[in-house]
Interface confidence: medium
């Protein structure tokens, strides 16, 4: 028996359902009583789901997995993972044994889009050209860790005094805070771009300082 899985990682958004595809080619006369199917975490060997002795043995993984029972006899051994969490990320191995044995691993990449950044300025009044200001760009509830870029009004990178911190919350999602310390020009726009590297999603925020007043 030959087991096939998708070579590319399966990308799933947090809180959505993911299908880890796995298939085999049953021989003529194949019966589900002959099938032993195991899904497990590749690294820890923890059992996720199994089908053996002619029946679905059920989920051994937080009761959030399911097979496609009607499709098993056609060789579809895919696994449905419900309400994906950050902690589900990793490699899953699909083992199929009829008389032969084969296995293959599929990677699950979890992702969550970052919120539109909020911008804060400190100090935020009585600003004059030449003043040192701190601009903070905050974006929330994303995964995996973000890439943060700062640009000026002409779209040129601001690589100076930037400090970025990313903290995971209890769900494993990241809140990003990036601080730019910059000397004000006569007027200017400061843009923050928070990029999710998996989703290739860019979230933009900007602040424009034109003497008085400021616009966000």
């Amino acid at each position: 028996v030959e087991v096939q899985v998708s070579e590319d990682p399966v990308v799933a958004l947090v809180d959505t359902d993911a299908t880890l595809r796995c298939s085999f080619s049953p021989e003529p006369g194949f019966s589900l009583r002959q099938l032993n199917l195991i899904w497990q975490l590749t690294d820890t060997k923890q059992l996720v789901h199994s089908f053996t002795e002619g029946r679905d043995q059920g989920s051994a993984y937080a009761n959030r997995t399911a097979l496609f029972p009607d499709l098993l006899v056609q060789g579809n051994a895919s696994l449905r993972l419900q309400r994906v969490r950050v902690t589900d990320e990793g490699s899953y191995t699909c083992f199929v044994s009829i008389q032969d044995f084969d296995s293959a691993a599929v990677s699950l990449q979890v992702a969550a889009p970052y919120s539109k950044p909020s911008m804060t300025l400190e100090p935020n009044k009585d600003l004059r050209p030449g003043d040192m200001v701190t601009i903070t760009c905050s974006s929330y509830q994303g995964y995996p860790e973000a890439e943060v870029f700062w640009k000026d009004g002409q779209g040129l990178p601001l690589t100076g005094n930037v400090t970025t911190s990313q903290m995971a919350n209890e769900r494993g999602l990241f809140d990003v805070h990036s601080v730019l310390r910059v000397v004000l020009g006569a007027n200017g726009t400061y843009s923050c771009l928070v990029r999710n590297p998996v989703l290739q999603q860019d979230a933009h925020g900007s602040v424009t300082i034109t003497g008085q007043p400021m616009t966000f």
Epitope: N36, I38, K45, L47, T52, Q99, F101
Partner: antibody
Framework: QVQLVESGAEVKKPGSSVKVSCKAS????????ISWVRQAPGQGLEWMGR????????NYAQKFQGRVTITADKSTSTAYMELSSLRSEDTAVYYC??????????????WGQGTLITVSS | DIQMTQSPSTLSASVGDRLTITCRAS??????LAWYQQKPGKAPKLLIY???YLQTGVPSRFSGSGSGTEFTLTITSLQPDDFASYYC?????????FGGGTKVEIK
């Protein structure tokens, strides 16, 4: 390279039970089936049953049903075969065997060294 | 249970001989047949699986053929190391069953 090391030879009285252990190393113990095969002196090979440690599910040859229990301890990568109500015809070498990481649950690339169980009054 | 019948039960041969051992299944087992070699006091060694596939590390003088109910193990040029017992095993269905064995001895 999978290695299977069995416990030592034992002499048992008829009607008693014996428990043979099989410790695996060098492979992915929990995912693969461990079978027990016995061989009476001068006789052929006889499959008794198997366990898939990750599932904790064992199945047995009808001949031994109710008399044999196969278990596995994933934490120590050890499989066990317990045979009860022993009789003289159970005198045999008992082997544990498996197909290794890349083979079958039904053919045996790797074998233990064998454990001789002698049943005698 | 599927019965496996091996013949002959004993075979006398000389180094360099070509040997054929036959295994018959009591019902169709497709190609789900393995062959093992066993030497006295040792565990069996897998030679052939799925009727004709040579296990890694097994010399090419060993070959297997057949499907359905009739299978053969052939040793093209017998070597001193080949004097042993040989067993077939079906794995089409539970319980797995072995043939009674063929002992290859020196003529």
């Amino acid at each position: 390279q999978v290695q299977l090391v069995e416990s030592g030879a034992e002499v048992k009285k008829p009607g008693s039970s014996v428990k043979v252990s099989c410790k695996a190393s060098g492979g992915t113990f929990s995912s693969y089936a461990i079978s027990w095969v016995r061989q009476a002196p001068g006789q052929g090979l006889e499959w008794m049953g198997r366990i898939i440690p990750i599932l904790g599910i064992a199945n047995y040859a009808q001949k031994f049903q109710g008399r044999v229990t196969i278990t596995a301890d994933k934490s120590t990568s050890t499989a066990y075969m317990e045979l009860s109500s022993l009789r003289s015809e159970d005198t045999a070498v008992y082997y544990c065997a498996n197909g290794g990481d890349s083979s079958s649950w039904y053919t045996f690339d790797y074998w233990g060294q064998g454990t001789l169980i002698t049943v005698s009054s | 249970d599927i019965q496996m019948t091996q013949s002959p039960s004993t075979l006398s041969a000389s180094v360099g001989d070509r040997l054929t051992i036959t295994c018959r299944a009591s019902q169709n087992i497709n190609s789900w047949l393995a062959w093992y070699q066993q030497k006295p006091g040792k565990a069996p060694k897998l030679l052939i699986y799925k009727a004709s596939y040579l296990q890694t590390g097994v010399p090419s003088r060993f070959s297997g053929s057949g499907s359905g109910t009739e299978f053969t193990l052939t040793i093209t040029s017998l070597q001193p190391d080949d004097f042993a017992s040989y067993y077939c095993q079906q794995y089409d269905s539970n319980p797995l069953t072995f043939g009674g064995g063929t002992k290859v001895e020196i003529k």
